[in-house]
């Protein structure tokens, strides 16, 4: 059974998917379209780096730019750093600039939504 | 403006390989994935796979995974689409076309590819 | 693989009449988060390259005149033409870009009589 054909049988059952099971399955060649991974847990989500977005969408990562105003992906974004945003080859703006230190201060994100942003 | 100006006809043999190009102009080439798609005369259109310009990641339908490769050339902003084993029922023109987000945006003018012995 | 259906296979209308195109999917096209759906409308008109109308089903792409307007969610969509212009003339595709292989309609004739 290829990615493709496994994707399709656990499709219905990833709504509440941790974040582990998400890493785990960004290396089964899935190709996740972009509907059910916008279904997916924000929580689930926004730990993922660009790579494993990358490589749990595959082709349908292109996709990400046309939702981009959307949750999860905004908060994904903004979660990025803007170099690794970049190798999308999608335009996308909103990441942490580069030089900077990501704080993870789960109380300041609680409040404000966003990671804490230490400048060069 | 943003303008896609593909390579020339060619007539190649079965068997034989073919390299059509696609120079982008008007835009940040990185910024956008291109896609290539074919027509067969007469027929629709039929998506063959698309590549990310910043990083060389390319995706390919199914249908001719074994036989196509994508790549491109950031120094000049170019795309370029290769098919191998050729076979008269690749006899077609081949377009590329930008994407606009995963609609297809802009579209170059197209190149015919004649398979024939 | 996600089959697009278009109806009919050729069209032949009056100038200034409308016209209207059907396209169906074998599955959903919508994303129920953003409530997009993944279908583009295309035009080809005779001897050129295809050029995008219409994309998320209903949004004209910018230059594009008002008379062409395209409807419809889920599997079902229709692109109408409100007055049908001797420079329509042309083959329409729709695509869905929902899931790969991204397949497109097999395409519907527009004829002036």
């Known amino acids: 059974m290829n990615g493709s054909e496994y994707f399709v049988k656990i499709q219905s059952f990833l709504g509440g998917a941790p974040t582990e099971d998400l890493k785990a399955l960004s290396q089964q060649n899935v190709s996740m379209d972009l509907a059910t991974f916008m279904k997916l847990r924000t929580d689930a989500v926004l730990p993922l780096t660009v790579a494993e977005v990358q490589k749990l969408l595959g082709p349908h990562v292109e996709g990400l730019k046309a939702e981009e105003r959307h949750r999860p992906v905004r908060d994904w974004i903004l979660r990025q750093r803007q170099d690794d945003l970049d190798t999308l080859g999608l335009g996308l703006q909103g990441g942490i600039p580069n030089g900077y230190l990501v704080l993870d201060l789960s109380m300041q994100e609680a409040l404000s939504g966003t990671p804490c942003l230490l400048g060069p | 403006e943003v303008q896609l100006v593909q390579s020339g006809a060619e007539v190649k043999k079965p068997g034989a390989s073919v390299k059509v190009s696609c120079k982008a102009s008007g835009y940040t080439f990185t910024n956008y994935w291109m896609h290539w798609v074919r027509q067969a005369p007469g027929q629709g259109l039929e998506w063959m796979g698309n590549?990310?310009?910043?990083?060389?990641?390319?995706y390919y339908n199914e249908r001719f995974m074994s036989r196509v490769t994508m790549t491109v050339d950031k120094s000049t902003s170019t795309a370029y689409m290769e098919l191998s084993s050729l076979r008269s029922e690749d006899t077609a023109v081949y377009y590329c076309a930008r994407s606009g987000g995963l609609w297809l945006a802009f579209w170059g003018q197209g190149t015919l590819v004649t398979v024939s012995s | 693989d996600i089959v697009m259906t278009q109806t009919p296979l050729s069209l032949s209308v009056t100038p200034g009449q409308p016209a209207s195109i059907s396209c169906k999917s074998s599955?959903?096209?919508?994303?129920?988060?953003?409530?997009?759906?993944?279908l583009a409308w295309y035009q080809q008109k005779p001897g050129q390259s295809p050029t995008l109308l219409v994309y998320?089903?209903?949004t004209r792409e910018s230059g594009v005149p008002d008379r062409f307007s395209g409807s419809g969610s889920g599997t079902d969509f229709t692109l109408k033409i409100s007055r049908v212009e001797a420079e329509d003339v042309g083959v329409y595709y729709c695509q869905q870009h929902y899931r790969t292989p991204y397949t497109f309609g097999g395409g519907t004739k527009v004829e002036i009589k």
């Open positions: 998320f089903a209903s």
């Open positions: 599955q959903t096209l919508l994303n129920s988060v953003s409530q997009n759906n993944y």
């Open positions: 590549i990310n310009p910043s990083s060389g990641d390319s």
